[in-house]
């Protein structure tokens, strides 16, 4: 009987663990290339897929171009941004490019915005080469509160690689705040 009880307790424990894991918030958002904005300086990317291809979201919300935290916790945030130019893509006005990504946190309760992560480089993409490519990956561990919003800003959005395996960002909760 004691062994049976232990088995039942164990299975309940597994179930509780599993349901807790299933409730763990996460998001992986991929660029919606049909709606990339204009600009050359810092431009906010507001159009992302959350439910097609590799894109998925659970217990977080995507609204108005921002990823909204629904549960307090420590989260791992990441972003991968690829820039590319091919001689058939369009006409480059300059070879000198600042290719940057900024991951920003906005708090609604106390209206404020903070850059959590940034990455990138200045590049010289000469016309002597028919193809140019540059990738940026940033990631970090942050304490986030419910209602806080994560957004992505980039420079030179017209040079973004529109593939789902190239330009994406996401988050997953690692643990509760004690």
């Amino acid at each position: 009987i004691r062994a049976e009880k232990a088995m039942v307790d164990g299975s309940w424990l597994d179930l509780a663990k599993r349901s807790k894991l299933e409730a763990q918030p996460f998001a992986h958002l991929t660029i919606n290339a049909t709606d990339i904005p204009s600009g050359s300086h810092k431009v906010s990317l507001s159009s992302w897929y959350h439910d097609r291809g590799w894109a998925k979201i659970s217990n977080m919300t995507f609204s108005n171009g921002k990823l909204i935290v629904n549960q307090d916790g420590f989260y791992y945030l990441y972003a991968n941004i690829c820039f590319r130019h091919h001689e058939t893509s369009g006409d480059l006005a300059t070879e000198y490019l600042q290719l940057m990504v900024y991951v920003t946190k906005t708090s609604i309760k106390i209206p404020s915005s903070h850059t959590l992560m940034k990455g990138g480089s200045t590049k010289y993409w000469s016309g002597n080469s028919e193809f140019h490519f540059y990738s940026i990956n940033v990631g970090g561990f942050f304490k986030l509160r419910s209602g806080e919003e994560i957004s992505i800003e980039v420079s030179n959005p017209s040079l973004l690689d529109p593939d789902q395996d190239a330009t994406y960002f996401g988050a997953f909760k690692v643990r509760d705040i004690d």
């Epitope: 204009s38 130019h85 006409d91 006005a93 300059t94 000469s126």
Partner: antibody, heavy 121, light 107 residues
Framework: EVQLVESGGDLVKPGGSLKLSCAAS????????MSWVRQTPDKRLEWVAT????????YYPDSVKGRFTISRDNAKNTLYLQMSSLKSEDTAMYYC??????????????WGTGTTVTVSS | DIVMTQSHKFMSTSVGDRVSITCKAS??????VAWYQQKPGQSPKLLIY???YRYTGVPDRFTGSGSGTDFTFTISSVQAEDLAVYYC?????????FGGGTNLEIK
């Protein structure tokens, strides 16, 4: 003050050649892509050529490709347009224009005063 | 090539009036449309870019709107000095193309 001043316009016979110049001042010339835009006698505007800030990319519409060559000398803050095999339909006021905006989607934010090219026998 | 069509070659208006000039693209150009003003005997001047952004120093009576294929340029209260030809231009792709121009006459 940002200024673009074109020169070199003239009366030339069909099949002839001409070189236009554009002197830039009041801004860091080497940071900007530049273009030539022409205005025909019926007042239509037509993009003619573009060169990137460092000079390694050049672009032309089909109407002038192979006949016109855009170039620049960043040390002299000067833009050029070498025109050859000129046709009567090349008769126009030629403007030098600075590019603004961003890659692939640039527009013309500053225009010069223009120089007149007349192709006639 | 993308064709930009300004249906009105001439438009007549009075000082203080609101006037709108339209421009239609032969295919989707997103919001990549610029508007230029050319006064008699002068070179063109940029007023609006990316459909709705006013260029530096342009008075706020000039506005632009639209996306896709249909674009509008509006002067909210026409002044005597606004007598000019107004051109739209797509800056979506090359070759860059212009509309035929709309000549604004002041009554």
């Amino acid at each position: 003050e940002v200024q673009l001043v074109e020169s070199g316009g003239d009366l030339v016979k069909p099949g002839g050649s001409l070189k236009l110049s554009c002197a830039a001042s009041g801004f860091t010339f080497s940071r900007y892509g530049m273009s030539w835009v022409r205005q025909t006698p019926d007042k239509r505007l037509e993009w003619v050529a573009t060169i990137s800030s460092g000079g390694s990319y050049t672009y032309y519409p089909d109407s002038v490709k192979g006949r016109f060559t855009i170039s620049r000398d960043n040390a002299k803050n000067t833009l050029y347009l070498q025109m050859s095999s000129l046709k009567s339909e090349d008769t126009a006021m030629y403007y030098c224009a600075r590019l603004d905006g961003y890659n692939y989607r640039w527009y013309f934010d500053v225009w010069g005063t223009g120089t007149t090219v007349t192709v006639s026998s | 090539d993308i064709v930009m069509t300004q249906s009105h070659k001439f438009m007549s208006t009075s000082v203080g009036d609101r006037v709108s000039i339209t421009c239609k693209a032969s295919q989707d150009v997103s919001s990549a449309v610029a508007w230029y003003q050319q006064k008699p005997g002068q070179s063109p001047k940029l007023l609006i870019y990316s459909a709705s952004y006013r260029y530096t120093g342009v008075p706020d009576r000039f506005t632009g709107s639209g996306s896709g294929t249909d674009f509008t340029f509006t002067i909210s209260s026409v002044q005597a000095e606004d007598l000019a030809v107004y051109y739209c231009q797509q800056h979506y792709s090359s070759p860059r193309t212009f509309g035929g121009g709309t000549n604004l006459e002041i009554k």
